[in-house]
Interface confidence: low
C-alpha cells in the first residue's frame, strides 16, 4: 500500500503500543445539518415495512442520544394497506462507533465502543425451510 | 437533571473550553463480532428494495472502511419478481461518528466528524404531486 509520511506537526504520543490513547477534538465537523431522523424523511411512515423510532439515552456515552428503529409489523404492508404475512419486515442494522466514558463519569476520557443499531426496516421474502 | 460527581481517578484536562480535546482509548470494546455487512445478513438481496454494498476506503478516517448501500432499482420488486414503478426504492440514511486525522497523516490526533451513510434500502409509496 501507499505509505503517507507522518506530518511533522503532529502532537507527541507517549505510548506507541496498542491499545493506544489518542487525542480527539470533540468539536464535531458536521457535513450534515439534520440530526432528527423524523425530520430528515418520512420513509419510516411511507415504507411497506414501517417502523417506529425510539430514543435511547445514555449520559455515559457520546453521543448520548441514539435513535433505534423498531419494525411495526411482522409482515409488510400490501397494496390494499393490509399486512401481508407472506413477506417479512426486518430491521436493517449497522455497527456504529460511539465514545464510552472510561473511567465512568469522566468528562475528558473515553474508550471507543462499537454498538449495533437498527436504522430502519426493509421488506424481505421469507426463507422457507422445506422438511424432507 | 441529575448531576453525576466527577470520578476522582479521571485524567487531568488542561483545557475545559469547547472545542475540547479528550483522551480516547482506541482499543475498541466491541459488543458485536460481525463487521462485513454482506455476511451479517442477506437482506440486501432478499429485499423488495434490494441494494448493492460499496466499499468506501479513506486512510485518513477511522474506521478507514465504511460500506455504502446503493439501491439497485428505481422501483420495488413485486410478487412476480419484476420491478413495480408504482413504488420506490429509497436509501435509509444515518449519521455516524468517525474520527478524522487532524492534522492530516497524524497517527495519534483526530477530530470527530459526522458523516451521512446509506445503510440499506426500503420500499416506499411515492409522493404524487397533483397539478392544480
Amino acid at each position: 500500500g501507499i505509505t503517507i509520511p507522518r506530518n511533522p506537526g503532529c502532537p507527541n504520543s507517549e505510548d506507541k503500543n496498542f491499545p493506544r490513547t489518542v487525542m480527539v477534538n470533540l468539536n464535531i465537523h458536521n457535513r450534515n445539518t439534520n440530526t432528527n431522523p423524523k425530520r430528515s424523511s418520512d420513509y419510516y411512515n411511507r415504507s411497506t415495512s414501517p417502523w417506529n423510532l425510539h430514543r435511547n439515552e445514555d449520559p455515559e456515552r457520546y453521543p448520548s442520544v441514539i435513535w433505534e428503529a423498531k419494525c411495526r409489523h411482522l409482515g409488510c404492508i400490501n397494496a390494499d394497506g393490509n399486512v401481508d404475512y407472506h413477506m417479512n419486515s426486518v430491521p436493517i442494522q449497522q455497527e456504529i462507533l460511539v465514545l464510552r466514558r472510561e473511567p465512568p463519569h469522566c468528562p475528558n476520557s473515553f474508550r471507543l465502543e462499537k454498538i449495533l443499531v437498527s436504522v430502519g426496516c426493509t421488506c424481505v421474502t421469507p426463507i422457507v425451510h422445506h422438511v424432507a | 437533571g441529575i448531576t453525576i460527581p466527577r470520578n476522582p481517578g479521571c485524567p487531568n484536562s488542561e483545557d475545559k473550553n469547547f472545542p475540547r480535546t479528550v483522551m480516547v482509548n482506541l482499543n475498541i470494546h466491541n459488543r458485536n463480532t460481525n463487521t462485513n455487512p454482506k455476511r451479517s445478513s442477506d437482506y440486501y438481496n432478499r429485499s423488495t428494495s434490494p441494494w448493492n454494498l460499496h466499499r468506501n476506503e479513506d486512510p485518513e478516517r477511522y474506521p478507514s472502511v465504511i460500506w455504502e448501500a446503493k439501491c439497485r432499482h428505481l422501483g420495488c420488486i413485486n410478487a412476480d419478481g419484476n420491478v413495480d414503478y408504482h413504488m420506490n426504492s429509497v436509501p435509509i440514511q444515518q449519521e455516524i461518528l468517525v474520527l478524522r486525522r487532524e492534522p492530516p497523516h497524524c497517527p495519534n490526533s483526530f477530530r470527530l466528524e459526522k458523516i451521512l451513510v446509506s445503510v440499506g434500502c426500503t420500499c416506499v409509496t411515492p409522493i404524487v404531486h397533483h397539478v392544480a
Epitope: - | 446503493k70 432499482h73 428505481l74 413485486n78 419478481g81
Partner: antibody, heavy 118, light 110 residues
Framework: EVQLLESGGGLVQPGGSLRLSCAAS????????MSWVRQAPGKGLEWVSA????????YYADSVKGRFTISRDNSKNTLYLQMNSLRAEDTAVYYC???????????WGQGTMVTVSS | NFMLTQPHSVSESPGKTVTISCTRS????????VQWYQQRPGSAPTIVIF?????PSGVPDRFSGSIDSSSNSASLTISRLKTEDEADYYC?????????FGGGTKLTVL
C-alpha cells in the same frame, strides 16, 4: 442478441393519436422492465414512460401523464405506446429501451419518427 | 425535480484525454447510480458506463466513470482519444420519482 424494432411513427395533426410498437427478440421479454425515451430534432434525450415486466405497473414523465399509455403483450414480445392528444412538442424520434433506468443492460432500438404538425 | 448539467461541447486532439462533467442540481448524486450514453450522428444511443463506473462488455477500457460527492458531480473520462469517439455524450440518473438525462455534450475530436 438483443433486438428492439420500433414501428408506427408518422405524421399526425395536433390533437391526433398514434400507437407505437416495439418488437423485442433475443431475450426473455417478460423478465424485463421496458421504457420509451424520445429525442426531439437537434435536442437531447427525454425519458417518457416505463412498464414492469408483468405489465402490471406503469410509470410516466409529467410531460405525457394523462395523454400517453404504455402497455405490453408478453405473448407477442411487444411493447406499445398509445399517444393521444398529441402536441407539436411531442415531435421526436421515439426509442424503445430495455431496462434503461438502471443501465445494467441499456439496449436500445433504432427509433421511429413521430411528427405532429398541421 | 432535479437537473443534470453538462457542458455543451468539448474538443480535444486524438491520443489525448478528455473529461466530461455532469452536475446534479439538487439531491445527492451519490445516492443513485449515474449512467453515460454515447450517441453518434444518425444512430441510437448506446450505454458506455453504468452504475457510476462500470463498463459494459465491448466498451474499451479507455472509457471510465467517476463520482465526486463533494461537488455532487459525475465525470466521464475518455483517454487515448480516437476519431471514432466523436459523438454526443449524455449522463443519466434518477430520484425516487423521476428519471433524468443531462442535456448532452458534443465531443469533437480535432
Amino acid at each position: 442478441e438483443v433486438q428492439l424494432l420500433e414501428s408506427g411513427g408518422g405524421l399526425v395533426q395536433p390533437g391526433g393519436s398514434l400507437r407505437l410498437s416495439c418488437a423485442a427478440s433475443g431475450f426473455t421479454f417478460s423478465s424485463y422492465a421496458m421504457s420509451w425515451v424520445r429525442q426531439a430534432p437537434g435536442k437531447g434525450l427525454e425519458w417518457v414512460s416505463a412498464i414492469s415486466g408483468s405489465g402490471g405497473s406503469t410509470y410516466y414523465a409529467d410531460s405525457v401523464k394523462g395523454r400517453f399509455t404504455i402497455s405490453r403483450d408478453n405473448s407477442k414480445n411487444t411493447l406499445y405506446l398509445q399517444m393521444n392528444s398529441l402536441r407539436a412538442e411531442d415531435t421526436a424520434v421515439y426509442y424503445c429501451a430495455r431496462d434503461l433506468i438502471w443501465g445494467v443492460a441499456g439496449s436500445w432500438g433504432q427509433g421511429t419518427m413521430v411528427t405532429v404538425s398541421s | 425535480n432535479f437537473m443534470l448539467t453538462q457542458p455543451h461541447s468539448v474538443s480535444e486532439s486524438p491520443g489525448k484525454t478528455v473529461t466530461i462533467s455532469c452536475t446534479r442540481s439538487s439531491g445527492s448524486l451519490a445516492n443513485y447510480y449515474v449512467q453515460w450514453y454515447q450517441q453518434r450522428p444518425g444512430s441510437a444511443p448506446t450505454i458506455v458506463i453504468f452504475a457510476n463506473n462500470q463498463r459494459p462488455s465491448g466498451v474499451p477500457d479507455r472509457f471510465s466513470g467517476s463520482i465526486d460527492s463533494s461537488s455532487n458531480s459525475a465525470s466521464l473520462t475518455i483517454s487515448r482519444l480516437k476519431t471514432e469517439d466523436e459523438a454526443d455524450y449524455y449522463c443519466q440518473s434518477y430520484s425516487p420519482t423521476s428519471v433524468v438525462f443531462g442535456g448532452g455534450t458534443k465531443l469533437t475530436v480535432l
